[in-house]
């Protein structure tokens, strides 16, 4: 997963103008994640729910198969929250030698893959160290930015432990983009 | 304050047209809150500034007793941010004992009160363990994300703590919304 | 830097129309910083890539000398991300004195100076207490809300420690902003 | 230096209101909220509220709650209080104290204003 | 409600130690902006000597210095001088926003 380097200037294929109310916008929230096995150090994408409860897809904004995919060249507000649970992490255990643990760590990194250029580019990653000394921690890595984007691009969010992803509730984790 | 699961598609009522110019949109800031009892497993609502400072409401945007009120049915995006404060909390005391004790925690919850529904809607969570060894610890949690929200909706900010919130400043503790 | 107390109501100045494609936005991404001497308990201004990779400048918003210059008189939504790193805190050493060390902090402001007002002000602030006890740390601070800018108002990004920002990717640090 | 001066004692009829005012000094007034304080003859300190002099926001304990009203006049730095309704266990010193934003301690004090409720 | 309780009253000779504690009877006590001691000598306003449970102000002497363990928060006093007779308040806020003061203590130095 590289980062795009060269991903230059406005858009020129964008129409003439679309009215807020008829803009692509999505909103999608997280669901219990099928398991699908993936290389230790890999980034797993999670999938998402489009349609039930505060989730949805407007104005030609489509999801499909983990990804969103834009249907309008433009510049998109992106988001996302990953709210992340865990039991007591390695290095929590405060032990008396010299070298302390390296720590663990969570990360989430929204994915965009073009038809245009080859490799998937990180548009945004939010990575923490998590050194926890209680039995039980839970936290939030929230991600939002503004890029240009081309008809066509879809859009994924990967997490470093898919079995550490909140997928219980609606409002704790989530994914979501408009036409600004 | 259990959330809604089937809150459907795209709102009827929408005028044709609205320009970015006369969009409903507020910017409230956190204000000193008074003093007022409430249960302890509650979630409690915050208060706020909604014309000193940084803080306006504009295009009959309205904000009324701790609620940011819809005027216009349409896709809105929704943000907050608290920062909690506080002094060492519990979990922070490395006992010897085998089993660590249960972490602290804060949270934020945004919440929708709508006409149509009965029950208050959890829009956005963000919820954290707090198991801090410092004698003061502080940090904010974010939240922002797109909903459809009708006309007459009610958006208020929830906290699981209300005495470890940071009042001091407007730039630290805030929620808004915009229509998109 | 105090924070502006009265900052009054909706700019005056805005243009009639400005449909969507044609307002002011940028995606500022973080590069290597040079090393530039400061006051130690004064924040450090970040600079910015404005134009490789992932970042750009639209509609007049320009970039200069660590500013995004507003062009254009109305509300914007403005964002940043900052990732920072360091190895264990001080207040990380669990000693057995009776009195806890003073935590490590990482303070981001997103600071507006204007023509106007003699005073930069403080728009947005995530501060955050760090202490770690594993040997390396790294967390993310996010920030986003709407603010009314009159034209020539210019915005700048600091932080408590400019050598704890990683600077290695695009897509950890950014800085952002577009009329809503 | 930072210096709060209240008014002078009161002797005041159970019933009647009683207004004590505060005057700051050696820094910007509205920067900081200001806290009431009382203490009856003999007795411990008990809190009765503060007031924000920029926005002119309030909050008072639940105990004095519409019976007191805290204001402030800008043009001139001076914080007032207000008890109404007196009754003979209101007699007390009254300090106004200036908060910390971040800890919310007194950090500085009046030299008080002793309020005598007597018929 | 909420209750801060202190112990009447305590005494020691000139130059020994004396600590008196700060009881709550809530957790949420001092949880976000902890607990803060005053100094009350005879006929004079109260005067800040701890805030936050261990920070003394400017102008404070190091003799005095404060602690926490669990519910509880203390106040020592090292090197007793007979000046440091007079009563001494914790205080803190609990969770419904209102100032707490405890009962006082009063120094007796013999």
């Known amino acids: 997963f590289p980062t795009v380097t060269e991903e230059r200037s406005a858009p020129s294929a964008q129409p003439v103008y679309t009215p807020s109310r008829d803009k692509p916008k999505a909103h999608l929230t997280i669901m219990r994640q099928t398991p699908v096995p993936h290389l230790k150090n890999e980034l797993a994408a999670l999938h998402w729910e489009n349609n039930l409860g505060m989730a949805f897809t407007k104005n030609r904004m489509n999801y499909t198969n983990k990804f969103l995919v834009i249907p309008e060249s433009g510049d998109y507000f992106i988001y996302s929250q990953i709210t992340f649970r865990g039991t007591t992490s390695e290095c929590g255990d405060i032990s008396r030698v010299r070298r302390p643990k390296k720590p663990d760590s969570i990360t989430v990194v929204i994915t965009k893959v073009a038809d245009s250029y080859p490799e998937p580019a990180h548009l945004l990653t939010g990575t923490k160290s998590v050194c926890e000394i209680s039995s039980n921690w839970f936290q939030p890595i929230y991600l939002g930015a503004m890029f240009s984007l081309e008809e066509g691009d879809r859009l994924m969010v990967n997490v470093s432990d898919i079995s550490l992803v909140d997928y219980t509730k609606e409002d704790k984790t989530f994914f979501g983009a408009f036409l600004i | 304050f259990p959330t809604v699961t089937e809150e459907r598609s795209a709102p009827s009522a929408q005028p044709v047209y609205t320009p970015s110019r006369d969009k409903p949109k507020a910017h409230l800031t956190i204000m000193r809150q008074t003093p007022v009892p409430h249960l302890k497993n509650e979630l409690a609502a915050l208060h706020w500034e909604n014309n000193l400072g940084m803080a306006f409401t504009k295009n009959r945007m309205n904000y009324t007793n701790k609620f940011l009120v819809i005027p216009e049915s349409g896709d809105y995006f929704i943000y907050s941010q608290i920062t909690f404060r506080g002094t060492t909390s519990e979990c922070g005391d490395i006992s010897r004992v085998r089993r660590p004790k249960k972490p602290d925690s804060i949270t934020v919850v945004i919440t929708k009160v709508a006409d149509s529904y009965p029950e208050p809607a959890h829009l956005l969570t963000g919820t954290k363990s707090v198991c801090e060894i410092s004698s003061n610890w502080f940090q904010p949690i974010y939240l922002g994300a797109m909903f459809s929200l009708e006309e007459g909706d009610r958006l208020m900010v929830n906290v699981s703590d209300i005495s470890l919130v940071d009042y001091t400043k407007e730039d630290k503790t805030f929620f808004g919304a915009f229509l998109i | 830097f105090p924070t502006v107390t009265e900052e009054r109501s909706a700019p005056s100045a805005q243009p009639v129309y400005t449909p969507s494609r044609d307002k002011p936005k940028a995606h500022l991404t973080i590069m290597r910083q040079t090393p530039v001497p400061h006051l130690k308990n004064e924040l450090a201004a970040l600079h910015w890539e404005n134009n490789l990779g992932m970042a750009f400048t639209k509609n007049r918003m320009n970039y200069t000398n660590k500013f995004l210059v507003i062009p254009e008189s109305g509300d914007y939504f403005i964002y940043s991300q900052i990732t920072f790193r360091g190895t264990t805190s001080e207040c990380g050493d669990i000693s057995r004195v009776r009195r806890p060390k003073k935590p490590d902090s990482i303070t981001v402001v997103i600071t507006k100076v204007a023509d106007s007002y003699p005073e930069p002000a403080h728009l947005l602030t995530g501060t955050k207490s760090v202490c770690e006890i594993s040997s390396n740390w790294f967390q993310p601070i996010y920030l986003g809300a709407m603010f009314s800018l009159e034209e020539g108002d210019r915005l700048m990004v600091n932080v408590s420690d400019i050598s704890l920002v990683d600077y290695t990717k695009e897509d950890k640090t950014f800085f952002g902003a577009f009329l809503i | 230096q930072v210096q709060l001066v209240q008014s002078g004692a009161e002797v005041k009829k159970p019933g009647a209101s009683v207004k004590v005012s505060c005057k700051a000094s050696?820094?910007?007034?509205?920067?900081?909220?200001i806290n009431w304080v009382r203490q009856a003859p003999g007795q411990g300190l008990e809190w009765m509220g503060w007031?924000?002099?920029?926005?002119?926001?309030?909050g008072y304990a639940q105990k004095f709650q519409g019976r007191v009203t805290m204001t402030a006049d800008r043009s001139t730095s001076t914080a007032y209080m207000e008890l109404s309704s007196l009754r003979s266990e209101d007699t007390a010193v009254y300090y106004c104290?200036?908060?910390?934003?971040?800890?919310?301690?007194?950090?500085?004090w009046g030299q008080g204003t002793l309020v005598t409720v007597s018929s | 409600q909420s209750v801060l309780t202190q112990p009447p009253s305590v005494s020691g000779a000139p130059g020994q130690r004396v600590t008196i504690s700060c009881t709550s009877s809530?957790?949420?006590?001092?949880?976000?902006?902890?607990v803060h001691w005053y100094q009350q000598l005879p006929g004079t306003a109260p005067k800040l000597l701890i805030e936050?449970?261990?920070n003394r102000p400017s102008g404070v002497p190091d003799r005095f210095s404060g602690s926490k363990s669990g519910t509880s928060a203390s106040l020592t006093i090292t090197g007793l001088l007979p000046e440091d007779e007079g009563d001494y308040y914790c205080?803190?806020?609990?969770?419904?926003?209102?100032?707490?003061f405890g009962g006082g203590t009063k120094l007796t130095v013999l």
């Open positions: 104290a200036r908060e910390v934003p971040e800890t919310a301690a007194f950090e500085y």
């Open positions: 050696g820094y910007t007034f509205t920067s900081y909220d």
């Open positions: 007031l924000n002099p920029n926005s002119g926001y309030t």
């Open positions: 809530s957790s949420d006590i001092g949880a976000g902006l902890g």
């Open positions: 936050g449970y261990y």
């Open positions: 205080q803190s806020w609990d969770g419904t926003l209102s100032a707490l």
